[in-house]
Interface confidence: low
């Protein structure tokens, strides 16, 4: 029987819902259904329709009410500027089509702040950041006229007000009204306005979400206010004490749909590893919700700060877990989190108003039942005494991110609920959770966490340093012989960590050169630190031309580094810092964490090598299982080590070797590789288990890395387990915790 | 047990300043906010501001901005308030009293037995 | 700034009696209200804060109510010690205010 025949009760026909140029999916069970155009189109006049109980599908209505009677698929456009004010932009025209450009400048007398050229993107959206034209005559900077929208209000005094609007059918997202404060900032956040059909580009979320929660600032902790001259950035700081609640909401109602769910799950899961490996353990609430609430985890639970354990029990909540009771109460899930934060009888732990207090909300917007959830928002900033006192707001200590889920987000609802503060997003509407794992990137204010070991900031936004924050290129200059080039590791604040071989005994101090985070400008050195049993020349008279046993040494440098996104340690085997970067326990031993990074198995690794002025990283394994004979055996193959009638002779238990093509082809390192580091990259941080320091095969002859290399190119690396005894006496200042 | 034991009596010529003391004792002095509250003869309490000892932070009533300033010694437990360009208006009896632990919106649970200032050519 | 009207003023009473202070702030003050003994010769004492929440070591007669705008103090069976004057204190918003006080006398 066709399905439209044998409907059930409030079930639509499927006949004549087609839509021009695209497609249509089921959502609901058949109670809704969604419009997909292709990328650059959108769907006109709706993008969603519901099916009515009367039977029929909802009308096909304009954003003016006319009535249409088949949906199709039209040509994305981007809005004009309404208003641009104290300057032109060109070219002028009622709309733009997809990669058409504008440029703004300003008339005399004012200076451009923002974009001066702007793209129309694939969704709907101008590229850059909203141009303004500016004299700096206010109290306030001009908080400018996002494109689409429209701003009542041209006075930026202390306490003058700007509102926004925007045309018919779009809905506002930010802040309508923006206050000009002391200090010179506005309240709220940008506005923008938004056509249902845009959604926000993983990459869009990624940027965003992260930067708000990456703000730093400079001075003044919260809870002891600030000046009102001072303007201020925010952080969120996550200080070792663990005083940040992070607060998972997830939406598990009918309108979310089992699969968003499941996306929301993975991207949360990947939020709590994020957050893992930064060695700090802020504890975790977590709630679902769809007619009624459901407590998982409990901030004041003992394992609440467990990461591990807040994982397991978030992979283990079932979609099906809210199917009886499928409504949409988001207020009741907030009253949930209302009621973790708030303490018993109305007295505080110590510490309460340090704590940070983060909720990220997953839905698709449509509350459908148990009021207004704003409400319990304001409750919320008032049990945090937020927004009370005007010298010390505390606005830091709660931010609220709602992440709208799926084509019938109500963009209102959202943004209601999320925090509006200055330059920041707090509201994203997402198409797909699946594409959004890779917003869950860096979630904390670095400076904090500098000083954690193997840290990185791996946004697509990110330099070569920002990614190998460790990475040191030395330089040993040699007059009328040239100069050397190897790399090295940033071990702490005043060490380097490279190979013995770079230098000769006759290098001085000032021919060596050191660069960090991708300055310019070389570092001092104070003095080269070699180990003690690395020579050469050891065993010449056994016709071993070059002898690399401990090839390791330590550059110290005269002034202390400046820790910051592009210049931080590596982890180092048997420390405190490595213990934590593994999330293993305390009493954890050096030998526990060599079973952990140097099983007897194939070990995933990498290295670091310059290709073109870039910094790569280069996949490997460590032959540390049954292929670790067969790869230490082909260091005959290396010049000058043919006659070696034993192997051990040169190959001593000091080194790792990488190399082969199994159980994949591994890239080789090449001679300006040599003193970098052997990486083993576990629970999202980086642990320098080697030092590179010589090969078989110079894959890398006229300056290009050769594509086809013989099976017996290996390269071998100083196991820094073996060096340790070494390593803690030389670094014994340095606080790095040896075990 | 909590005490805040406040200085003796100053009697002060108009113009002039007077400063005051509050001395801790009985709880962890940089846990707890310091208000400072005053009373006119035959009128009610108004509030001054309060320090926050830990960090030497402190607010003031809008009324009292250029009149008080509060600091405090961590290493002897004592918050001080100066009264500065004294009128006939700052005679009252000052009182210091402990805030909520940190800053919360606990009320003040103890208080000074008071400082009396007369100010009088 | 918050206004907080106290009333009555004045209040003669018996012992063992109840009697009741009212507090009204000009804006809402969620449930922040504190209430407070004043004897000569005797440091203020701290009776009531956030609304309805009994200072440790105050006898269970005191007790307090209300939110938003309109807070009372009621002390039941009135002992001879508890004749003095009372205040009520926002502890919302600063700059934190007062009441103008009642004093409670034996009739």
């Known amino acids: 029987t066709p399905w439209s025949l044998a409907r059930p009760q409030g079930s639509c026909s499927l006949e004549g819902v087609e839509i021009k140029g695209g497609s249509f999916r089921l959502l609901q069970e058949g109670q809704a259904l969604e419009y997909v155009c292709p990328s650059g189109f959108y769907p006109y006049p709706v993008q969603t329709r519901t099916c009515r109980s009367t039977g029929s599908w909802s009308t096909l209505k304009t954003q003016d009410q006319k009535t249409v009677r088949k949906a199709e698929c039209r040509a994305i456009h981007c809005p004009r500027p309404h208003d641009f004010e104290n300057g032109e932009y060109w070219p002028r025209s009622p709309y733009y089509n997809v990669s058409d450009e504008i440029s703004f400048h300003c008339y005399d007398g004012y200076t451009l702040r923002g974009s001066a050229n702007r793209t129309c993107q694939v969704n709907g959206r101008w590229s850059g950041q909203t141009a303004i034209c500016d004299n700096g005559a206010g109290y306030c900077s001009n908080p400018g006229i996002p494109i689409g929208t429209r701003k009542v209000g041209s006075q930026y005094r202390l306490e003058d007000s700007v509102t926004y609007h925007c045309s018919r059918g779009l809905t506002l997202r930010g802040s309508q009204r923006r206050t000009c404060q002391e200090g010179g900032s506005w309240s709220g956040t940008e506005p923008s306005c938004q056509d249902s059909f845009m959604y926000d580009t993983p990459q869009e979320v990624a940027e965003a979400f992260l930067s708000s929660l990456t703000e730093t600032i400079e001075g003044v902790d919260a809870e002891d206010g600030h000046g009102p001259g001072e303007q201020q950035k925010r952080k969120i700081v996550l200080d070792p004490s663990g005083s940040m609640n992070i607060y998972l909401v997830l939406d598990g109602s009918d309108s979310i749909g089992a699969s968003n769910f499941t996306g929301a799950k993975k991207c949360l899961v990947n939020l709590i590893e994020k957050v893992a490996s930064y060695g700090v353990k802020p504890r975790y609430g977590l709630v679902t919700y769809a007619t009624y609430p459901k407590i998982w985890v409990k901030v004041s639970e003992a394992d609440s700060s467990n990461a591990d354990w807040v994982t397991k029990q978030l992979n283990e909540i079932n979609y099906e877990d809210h199917k009886l009771k499928s409504g949409t109460n988001t207020k009741k899930a907030l009253q949930a989190v209302y009621s973790m934060m708030s303490w018993p009888d109305d007295v505080p732990p110590e510490g309460w108003n340090r704590t940070r207090h983060v909720i990220i909300l997953m839905t698709d917007g449509l509350h459908n039942m148990g009021g207004d959830p704003i409400t319990v928002i304001d409750e919320i900033r008032d049990l945090l005494y937020i927004g009370k006192d005007r010298k010390n707001p505390r606005e830091d200590y709660l931010d609220v991110y709602v992440f709208g889920v799926g084509p019938l987000v109500n963009q209102v609802n959202i943004n209601a609920l999320a925090s509006k503060k200055d330059n920041e997003q707090h509201v994203f509407k997402v198409k797909d959770m699946e594409n959004l794992e890779d917003v869950f990137y860096q979630m904390i204010d670095e400076s904090q966490s500098l000083s954690l070991c193997g840290m990185v900031w791996e946004h697509r936004k990110g330099t070569d340093y920002h990614k190998q924050p460790w990475q040191a290129k030395i330089s040993v200059i040699r007059p009328s012989k040239g100069h050397e080039s190897c790399m090295g590791a940033v071990v702490s604040e005043y060490f380097v960590l490279t190979a013995a071989h770079c230098f000769t005994v006759d290098d001085k101090e000032h021919s060596i050169k050191v660069s960090v985070g991708g300055e310019k400008r070389d570092l001092e050195i104070e003095v080269v630190l070699f180990h003690p049993n690395y020579n050469i020349n050891g065993k010449k008279e056994a016709g071993i031309p070059e002898f690399y046993d401990y090839d390791v040494a330590l550059i110290k440098l005269k002034n202390k580094l400046k820790y910051g996104q592009t210049i931080r340690p590596i982890c180092l085997p048997c420390t405190e810092g490595t213990t934590r970067a593994l999330r293993l326990p305390p009493t954890t031993t050096c030998q526990q964490q060599k079973e952990e990074l140097l099983p007897a198995q194939d070990i995933k690794a990498l290295f670091v090598s310059e290709e073109e002025k870039k910094l790569t990283r280069k996949e490997v394994y460590i032959k540390n299982g049954d292929k670790k004979g067969s790869c230490e055996r082909d260091a005959q193959y290396a010049p000058g080590y043919d006659k070696v009638k034993d192997i051990s002779e040169v190959v001593t238990p000091r080194f790792l070797c990488t190399g082969g093509v199994s159980p994949y082809a591994d890239p080789n390192t090449c001679r300006g590789d040599s003193g970098g580091p052997l990486i083993v990259h576990k629970r999202s941080r980086f642990i320098q288990v080697g030092v590179i320091s010589w090969g078989v095969v110079d894959v890398c002859k006229n300056q290009k890395r050769q594509k086809q290399v013989p099976a017996h190119a290996r390269d071998f690396h100083i196991n820094l387990f073996q060096v340790l005894p070494w390593l803690k006496e030389k670094l014994q200042d340095e606080d790095l915790g040896f075990l | 047990q909590v005490q805040l034991q406040q200085s003796g009596a100053e009697l002060a010529k108009p113009g002039a300043s007077v400063r005051m003391s509050c001395k801790a004792s009985?709880?962890?002095?940089?846990?707890?906010?310091i208000h400072w509250v005053k009373q006119r003869p035959g009128q009610g309490l108004e509030w001054i501001g309060y320090?926050?000892?830990?960090?030497?932070?402190?607010d003031y009533n809008q009324k009292f901005k250029d009149k008080a300033t509060l600091t405090a010694d961590k290493s002897s437990s004592t918050v001080y308030m100066q009264l500065s360009s004294l009128t006939s208006e700052d005679s009252a009896v000052y009182y210091c009293a402990r805030g909520g632990q940190l800053g919360l919106r606990r009320a003040m649970d103890y208080w000074g037995q008071g400082t009396s200032v007369t100010v009088s050519s | 700034d918050v206004q907080i009207t106290q009333s009555p003023s004045y209040l003669a009473a018996s012992p063992g009696e109840t009697i009741t202070i009212n507090c009204r702030a000009s804006?809402?003050?969620?449930?922040?209200l504190a209430w407070y003994q004043d004897k000569p010769g005797k440091t203020n004492k701290l009776l009531i804060y956030s609304g309805s929440t009994l200072q440790s070591g105050i006898p269970s007669r005191f007790s307090g109510s209300g939110s938003g705008t309109d807070f009372t103090l009621t002390i039941s069976s009135l002992e001879p010690e508890d004749f003095a004057m009372y205040y009520c204190?926002?502890?919302?918003?600063?700059?934190?205010?007062f009441g103008g006080g009642t004093k409670l006398e034996i009739k």
């Open positions: 804006k809402s003050i969620s449930k922040y």
């Open positions: 204190q926002q502890h919302d918003e600063y700059p934190w205010t």
């Open positions: 009985g709880y962890t002095f940089t846990n707890y906010w």
């Open positions: 320090i926050n000892p830990n960090t030497g932070y402190n």
